[in-house]
């Protein structure tokens, strides 16, 4: 299927001009390659009329041009002084020959309709209303006023001043006069439909002295706006229907042959195909609203219509707006898993793509909720603190520059199952949807922390160990201290990774973290996790409570605990003379450093893991190390 997209049908009248926009995929080659507009002949050959190489055919000389808009990935063909000879089949395309990627466009140029010379033309959109002005002479002021619609032979009454109304105009037509002006009457027709189009005559008086005026009413279907979107990206339908329908229910539907199937409306209806990836947002009191769809699929391509009616369904004679959505399968958005599976008590690491050109954009993760019009409250973000109910179990890791950030959620429950969105404050096309499925755990977790009831005593040494299975042997293990701004990775290195081993003892693989001496700031959530390069894997969480020596070992409620802590960890105890100031200068404080420092995080993690020379003025130290016991046979 060609990734070029444009208007399928273009219609105009003689003497007018048209502007045809064609879309192409966002690649450097496409931006700079030849663009063309050609006319298809009976033989199937397509004769170039204009191209971006500067070619202009004789028949287009002085009346056409082709402009490339590389920043929008579009090119536009403007043709003026149209004649009926321009009616035909055309292609807009890309490539060195006219057999390249292209899109078929049908252009129809019709004659200007011949109307009586004094005819007043009103052009209105479907669903809108028209007020027809009917002037008359003063002597016809007392006479009957009327508006009729011309049919083949006669003129069928619409409304008159004796309050006679054609049944098909009841509730839609009214005849009135303004103020004291006795030389003009008005007829207003609302909820216009295609059937209302045609020639009308308004009349005041009877016989030869009657005042008559010819009116041509044109009722137009709105021109569909073209939307060119990448597979897996998102689209927003901005619907502006006007103040007159501000209080009506709104809907978005997709054309399906003769009907328009509602996808979503403000009365709570939603197509199951769009579950988890659609929101409808009323914008203001002027009848404006928008519908956002993420995770676009190729089957989402088609003709969409928005409208307003108390039923929340399409209704003839009510204002609409239309779009033609094209889904480009040559997507720049990477193909990621759209369903992530986890188990109760376990964890998931979700890789969220973002536009690599916008590495400094703010990253967010929100949970889609379908109640009402649907909404997606942010749970975590690069500058947004973790929501309270996710304390200790949710963090966002931004890997600057590589087009991916990771969201980790652990201590999973079945209530976490649902739809989540990855989004940034930058390129909105890169909003993606993930469905999280959570099954009941049927086996022990891969990562286990001991001791499980972790209460550390102030001033003493406290060690927690994280046991991992052999399958994680080659992966990097880490501990991090969680705060509502993220999980600061604690520098460590894996002793066992440097040793050669023949076998792996399932029971003895562990990575330990030592707090020495324990301080009050150490209280909070800690995570043990595995990762391979920038790809995060499983995690498990433990809450470490801190008590004074004198007190018993009563458990501190994790949600009441202060989760903020210093992050200054190393593998072994270091000289206590290292000052606090020096300590702060250590690079890579973790992925949730303040914005000023975050630029330096980049590739220093590797360097940091090896050095482990941080300390603090009061002689505290933290250590994190891996121990492997090898059995040689």
């Amino acid at each position: 299927k060609s990734p070029i997209f444009g208007p399928q049908e273009v219609s105009s009248i003689e003497g007018d001009s048209v502007s045809i926009t064609c879309y192409y995929p966002d690649t450097s080659v496409n931006r700079h390659t030849r663009k063309y507009w050609c006319r298809q002949g009976a033989s199937g050959m397509c004769t170039t009329l204009i191209s971006s190489n500067g070619y202009l055919s004789k028949e287009y000389s002085g009346r056409a041009n082709l402009i490339n808009f590389p920043e929008n990935n579009t090119f536009v063909i403007n043709i003026e002084q149209l004649t009926q000879d321009d009616t035909g089949s055309y292609k807009c395309g890309l490539g060195t020959s006219n057999r390249g990627l292209s899109f078929d466009v049908s252009l129809e140029v019709s004659q200007v309709p011949e109307l009586p010379s004094d005819t007043h033309v009103y052009t209105k959109d479907i669903g809108r209303n028209v007020t027809i002005e009917c002037p008359f002479k003063r002597e016809n002021a007392p006479s009957k006023k009327s508006l009729c619609k011309k049919t083949n032979q006669s003129c069928e009454l619409v409304i008159d001043s004796t309050e006679k109304v054609n049944p098909s105009y009841i509730g839609r037509a009214k005849l009135f006069m303004k103020g004291t002006d006795l030389t003009v009457f008005y007829v207003n027709i609302s909820h216009l439909t295609h059937n209302d189009a045609g020639l009308y005559i308004c009349q005041a008086g009877e016989g030869p002295s009657a005042d008559k005026k010819n009116v041509d009413l044109q009722v137009l279907a709105p021109e569909p706006e073209l939307l060119y979107k990448d597979l897996r990206s998102s689209v927003t339908f901005e619907c502006d229907l006007g103040r007159e329908v501000a209080n009506e229910a709104k809907y978005l539907c997709r054309m399906n042959k003769e009907t328009c199937d509602v996808i979503i409306n403000t009365l709570g209806k939603r197509d199951p195909d769009f579950e988890g990836r659609i929101l409808i947002t009323p914008k203001d009191d002027n009848g404006r609203f928008s519908v956002l769809i993420t995770g676009l699929r190729k089957e989402d391509a088609g003709h969409y219509q928005c409208g307003a009616h108390s039923s929340g369904l399409p209704q003839e004679g009510w204002p609409i707006q239309t779009w033609q959505l094209f889904v480009n399968e040559e997507s720049t958005i990477p193909n990621r898993r759209s369903v992530v599976k986890g188990v109760t008590g376990g964890s998931v690491a979700i890789a969220c793509p973002y536009n690599p050109k916008e590495s400094s954009s703010l990253k967010y993760w929100c949970r889609w909720e379908g109640d009402g019009n649907g909404h997606c409250p942010v749970l975590v973000g690069t500058q947004a603190q973790v929501q309270e109910e996710y304390e200790g179990r949710l963090a966002l890791f931004d890997q600057p520059g590589n087009g991916t950030y990771t969201v980790i959620l652990n201590q999973l429950t079945t209530e976490d199952a649902g739809f989540y969105w990855c989004l940034t404050n930058g390129d909105s096309r890169w909003r993606t949807t993930i469905e999280l499925q959570v099954a009941e755990a049927t086996r022990e977790p891969n990562l286990e922390v001991t001791p499980q009831n972790a209460t550390a005593v102030l001033g003493e040494t406290f060690t927690v160990s994280c046991h991992y299975p052999c399958k994680f042997y080659s992966q990097e293990k880490y501990w991090c201290k969680w705060s509502n701004k993220g999980c600061h990775i604690l520098p460590s290195h894996d002793e066992g990774a440097r040793q050669s081993s023949v076998s792996c003892d399932q029971s003895s693989q562990l990575v330990s973290m030592t707090l020495n001496p324990v301080s009050k700031e150490d209280e909070g959530w800690y995570w043990c996790g595995v990762k391979q390069g920038q790809t995060y894997g499983e995690t498990t969480a433990i809450y470490i409570a801190v008590e004074e020596r004198t007190r018993g070992s009563s458990h501190v409620n994790p949600t009441d605990a202060n989760a903020r802590a210093k992050v200054a960890l190393e593998e072994e105890v270091v000289d206590s003379s290292i000052s606090e100031k020096e300590n702060k200068a250590i690079p890579n404080p973790g992925p949730f450093a303040n914005e000023r420092e975050i630029q330096n995080v980049g590739d220093q993690a590797q360097e940091n893991r090896a050095s482990g020379d941080a300390g603090s003025a009061d002689g505290q130290s933290r250590s994190s190390s891996s121990k492997h016991h090898h059995h040689h046979h």
Epitope: H32, S52, L56, G62, N65, F69, P70, E71
Partner: nanobody, 127 residues
Framework: QVQLVESGGGLVQAGGSLRLSCAAS????????MVWLRQAPGKEREVVAA????????SYADSVKGRFTISRDNANVRVYLQMTGLKPEDTAIYYC????????????????????WGQGTLVTVSS
């Protein structure tokens, strides 16, 4: 294709004004967006100003915004560059060129493909 010939360059004192003109021949002048570029000795060629085919849209380099004005006359197949408040750093050879590309900002025109160039006109601004 269009053939282009620039004129109007010369020596002017800082703060002074000049009007450059570019005469085009060829039947398709009105089909093109027109661009004024300049090249100072030892520097890269840069787009100074651009105007759309109809004259309805313009784009300027930050360094000349508010001082230079580009316009076109499709009937007389000409494009103009009105330069005021000239500075010594405006000294360069000025070229006009035709393109079918249109960018939002003049800097992006570096990637544009230009179909026709003039031979250039020298503007010297003395301090």
């Amino acid at each position: 294709q269009v053939q282009l010939v620039e004129s109007g360059g010369g020596l002017v004192q800082a703060g002074g004004s000049l009007r450059l003109s570019c005469a085009a021949s060829g039947r398709s002048f009105s089909s093109y967006n027109m661009v004024w570029l300049r090249q100072a000795p030892g520097k890269e060629r840069e787009v100074v100003a651009a105007v759309t085919w109809s004259g309805g849209g313009t784009s300027y380099a930050d360094s000349v915004k508010g001082r230079f004005t580009i316009s076109r006359d499709n009937a007389n197949v000409r494009v103009y560059l009105q330069m005021t408040g000239l500075k010594p750093e405006d000294t360069a050879i000025y070229y006009c060129a035709a393109t079918q590309d249109w960018y939002g900002g003049s800097r992006a025109f570096r990637a544009a493909s230009f179909h026709s160039w003039g031979q250039g006109t020298l503007v010297t601004v003395s301090s």
